[in-house]
Interface confidence: low
């Protein structure tokens, strides 16, 4: 669900009457309106309506039973632990409950599209809200691991070796804060919309034209540039020092997170550069034009759907990339396929010495 | 400056046809939803029909569904409704109005409508 | 269908008064619209969503109301007020007028 504005979406909740007030001064009603005097108005689409009703139900149904999947093995397998958690896994921990919550909006939203929005203003409010916390929430968490990475590494700082769960709930908590204050425009302005033509109801958002832009601009560099600006930085450094101290094991210990950080750009690239497109026609510096606006908005829907698949890969990249991971998913299967059978519930002789990746020598990845 | 005019219209048998067509001018006419509107003498407002940007979707009351099409020629920057199987009911002033868009999203009102042509069904 | 019943359908004040129209859904509506009517001229918007007055409307027009009940507020009559009002809906197939409110000089 990209929670943009919809062209076919019709305005009516009455908690924005207020905000709306200012409307005729951003849109004059006046005798003396014409083309040369204001920015072209956005499109309606037609087409891009009908994209959306046929490709993201089936994709979201899909991306909602993976992530749950996924992800629920990933939280299981790091709640499994005899030991604490590392700092580094107590991200991915976070990381994990993030996506969750992320697809369980999913199918909400995949009705939205299919049909129409039949929760109410109240539930569009929750799960715009939680859709754009966790949506934050995976890029900031991912930066946080990038840094701790980076600290721990480069720096030979571990800044959360004494005390590490307070420091790292501390950080966590501070992300999640974060993340709700991005969330605030989401319980503020959507609501369930009817659209009386498509006589359907619509979750979206309902503010003017600024507003649209300034949130976009939000999402682009919160939860996209700036993590990703973290996340090369750090490992650009990280694999230098390693590179150079032809640390192989460490090598080897990083594949993993940079390999998630990979896919982190990979799947939200496109997303963020048709946003990118849609803000410079926003702002005037791309002509708007209907089949421009069409190509952007079916755009939107695919490249959208290729970020959500983010939230299923990140438990298909600890499995495939993490070794550790598939050895404690195995146990944890054991485990509870046979509760009685007291050695399978004994952790794996290297355990301890893996114990901790953000906290040994060789920085080697424990839980994952 | 926006403007709207009707033409088309005019005296009819029952059971006969009319086209009404509405020139559009003064904004991107291809980005707004159009809708025609009619009012009997001395009557109130009815809606007849509304089309999106792009000609693709189309929406009728029941009291025209079967009877009315509206349709679009953009590159004329023009509204049409082909009226058929017309009754002494339909006889009114037909408007034809504009939908305004508000932050991408169409509007169910009108923020410009025309002077309006009448069409009287009378045998 | 959602009928909107204005009242009254006649409205004799003078220059000066307060005047309240009012436009009753048959079911709750998410927002109202007024529209003001000259004789022999074309509608124009007057108040949409609710309350925000059109480009052009003077400030002593005020409209209110939620749900079932919405109001058109006039708080001093001026000769140019005197016209035929009618309030809109869209939040329920199909599209619907009032019946009117015709404001006329005392």
């Known amino acids: 669900m990209v929670l943009e504005v919809s062209d076919h979406q019709v305005l009516n909740d009455a908690e924005v009457a207020a905000l709306l007030e200012n409307f005729s001064s951003s849109y004059d009603y006046g005798e003396n309106e014409s083309d040369s005097c204001c920015t072209s108005p956005p499109c309606p689409q037609d087409f891009s309506l009908n994209f959306d009703r046929a490709f993201l139900p089936a994709l979201y149904s899909l991306l909602f039973l993976l992530g749950l999947l996924g992800n629920g093995a990933v939280a299981a397998v790091l709640l499994s632990r005899r030991t604490a958690l590392s700092s580094t896994d107590t991200f991915l921990l976070h990381l994990a409950v993030a996506d969750t919550l992320l697809v369980l909006t999913l199918p909400l939203w995949a009705v939205d599209a299919a049909v129409q929005w039949v929760f109410g203003s109240g539930l569009c409010k929750v799960a715009g809200a939680l859709f754009n916390i966790n949506f934050y929430a995976g890029a900031l968490l991912l930066a946080c691991i990038s840094f701790d990475r980076y600290l721990n590494i480069v720096h030979a700082t571990q800044l959360y070796r004494r005390g590490p769960p307070a420091r790292v709930t501390l950080t966590c908590l501070a992300v999640w804060g974060l993340c709700l204050l991005f969330a605030l425009p989401d319980f503020i302005f959507l609501s369930a919309h009817h659209d009386e033509r498509l006589n359907a109801t619509h979750c979206q958002y309902n503010f003017p034209q600024v507003g649209r832009t300034a949130l976009r601009v939000l999402q682009l560099v919160a939860g996209f540039l700036l993590p990703l600006l973290v996340m090369a930085y750090c490992y650009a450094h990280i694999l230098a020092v390693l590179l150079v101290s032809r640390g192989q094991r460490r090598l080897r210990a990083m594949r993993l997170v940079v390999v998630v950080v990979v896919a982190f750009a990979l799947c939200w690239t496109p997303y963020h550069l048709v946003v990118l497109v849609d803000i410079l026609m926003d702002l005037g510096a791309l002509a708007r034009n209907c089949g421009r606006e069409s190509r952007v908005d079916v755009a939107k829907s695919v490249t959208s759907g290729l970020g959500y698949m983010h939230c299923c890969l990140n438990p298909l990249l600890y499995a495939f990339v993490g070794v550790k991971f598939r050895e404690r998913m195995w146990m944890l299967l054991l485990r509870l396929g046979c509760p009685n059978q007291r050695g399978l519930q004994r952790q794996p002789s290297s355990s301890r010495r893996d114990s901790s990746w953000s906290e040994t020598s060789e920085a080697s990845y424990s839980g994952l | 400056e926006v403007q709207l005019l009707e033409s088309g219209g005019g005296l009819v048998q029952p059971g006969g046809s009319l086209r009404l067509s509405c020139a559009a001018s003064g904004f991107t006419f291809t980005s707004y939803a159009m809708s025609w509107v009619r009012q009997a003498p001395g009557k109130g407002l009815e809606w007849v029909a509304t089309i999106s940007h792009g000609g693709t979707y189309t929406y009728y009351p029941d009291s025209v569904k079967g009877r009315f099409t509206i349709s679009r020629d953009n590159a004329k920057n023009t509204l049409y409704l082909q009226m058929n199987s017309l009754r002494a009911e339909d006889t009114a002033v037909y408007y034809c109005?504009?939908?305004?868009?508000?932050?991408?999203?169409?509007?169910?009102?009108?923020?410009?409508w025309g002077q309006g042509t009448l069409v009287t069904v009378s045998s | 269908d959602i009928q909107l019943t204005q009242s009254p359908s006649f409205l004799s004040a003078s220059v000066g008064d307060r005047v309240t129209i009012t436009c009753r859904a048959s079911s709750g509506v998410n927002y109202l619209y007024w529209y003001q009517q000259k004789p022999g001229k074309a509608p124009k918007l007057w108040i949409y969503?609710?309350?925000t007055l059109a480009s052009g409307v003077p400030s002593r027009f005020s409209g209110s109301g939620s749900g079932n009940e919405y109001t058109l507020t006039i708080s001093s009559l001026q000769p140019e007020d005197f016209a035929t009002y009618y309030c809109q809906q869209f939040t329920s197939s199909p599209y619907t007028f009032g019946g009117g409110t015709k404001l006329e000089i005392k």
């Open positions: 109005a504009r939908h305004p868009i508000y932050s991408g999203n169409y509007q169910g009102y009108f923020d410009y």
């Open positions: 969503f609710t309350s």
